[in-house]
């Protein structure tokens, strides 16, 4: 899948964890979208 960024921000962003996609694992199905 594809995700485009730069159009809006996530106002509910957690303050303790980065909102970037976590490192891939073999269990990952939709890491960035």
């Amino acid at each position: 899948s594809e995700t485009t960024t730069g159009t809006s921000s996530n106002s509910s962003q957690s303050t303790s964890n980065s909102g970037l996609a976590p490192n891939p694992t073999n269990a990952t199905t939709k890491a960035a979208g």
Epitope: S9, Q13, T29, A31
Partner: antibody
């Protein structure tokens, strides 16, 4: 040790496409996203997007979404970035960079100079 | 998108000096600020991530601090090899954004 080795310099005409490769070694290629960053002459750093090597999911900077294609070949631990419909202002050094979740862009390729000129 | 503003844009200093570069974000990026060093013709090199964590192999004279909207990079005693351009970056959300850079020159 982690190494990212990019393909060589390219000279392209306006309207053409360019494909840059980035071969990874020294770590599990599938365990980290691969990002792409460019730098125009004398300018700052501009993030273009990234690819998940396992799922091939991509996240793009909106500015490049319509012109950039990111792919990977896990069998040879290589990521690719293709930029189409080149313009003169696409003249830049293009970098691949491994992104670790907690650490950000922790290892970078040496850069590939792309010159767009008629 | 988040905007990152670095100050100063240019900085002249001497070997042995202590220098500080500031990065301000247009909204909170929690602790997720990073700093990179770039020398002419070379790729950027990660120095600091998550606000204050030193990347492996980076000398301890480099120190990062801050959270929320303001981050600082301090070099405690400048060495000749430290004269370069420094960029801040946010790694809290997409799109990943860099500051405009601070060029550190020899006085």
């Amino acid at each position: 040790q982690v190494q990212l080795v990019q393909s060589g310099a390219e000279v392209k005409k306006p309207g053409a496409s360019v494909k840059v490769s980035c071969k990874a070694s020294g770590y599990d290629f599938t365990g980290y996203h691969m990002g792409w960053v460019r730098q125009a002459p004398g300018q700052g750093l501009e993030w273009m997007g990234e690819i998940n090597p396992i799922t091939s999911d991509k996240t793009f900077n909106q500015k490049f979404k319509s012109r950039v294609t990111m792919t990977r070949d896990t069998s040879i631990s290589t990521a690719y970035m293709e930029l189409s419909r080149l313009r003169s202002d696409d003249t830049a050094v293009y970098y691949c960079a491994r992104r670790d979740y907690g650490t950000s862009l922790d290892y970078w390729g040496q850069g590939t100079t792309v010159t767009v000129s008629s | 998108d988040i905007q990152l503003t670095q100050s100063p844009s240019f900085l002249s200093a001497s070997v042995g000096d202590r220098v500080t570069i500031t990065c301000r974000a247009s909204k909170s990026i929690s602790k997720y600020g990073a700093w990179y060093q770039q020398k002419p013709g070379k790729a950027p090199k990660l120095l600091i991530y998550a606000g204050s964590t030193l990347h492996s192999g980076i000398p301890s004279r480099f120190r990062g601090s801050g959270s929320g909207t303001e981050f600082t990079l301090t070099i405690s005693s400048l060495q000749p090899e430290d004269f370069a351009t420094y960029y801040c970056q946010q790694h809290n959300e997409y799109p990943i954004i860099f500051g405009q850079g601070t060029k550190l020159e020899i006085k």
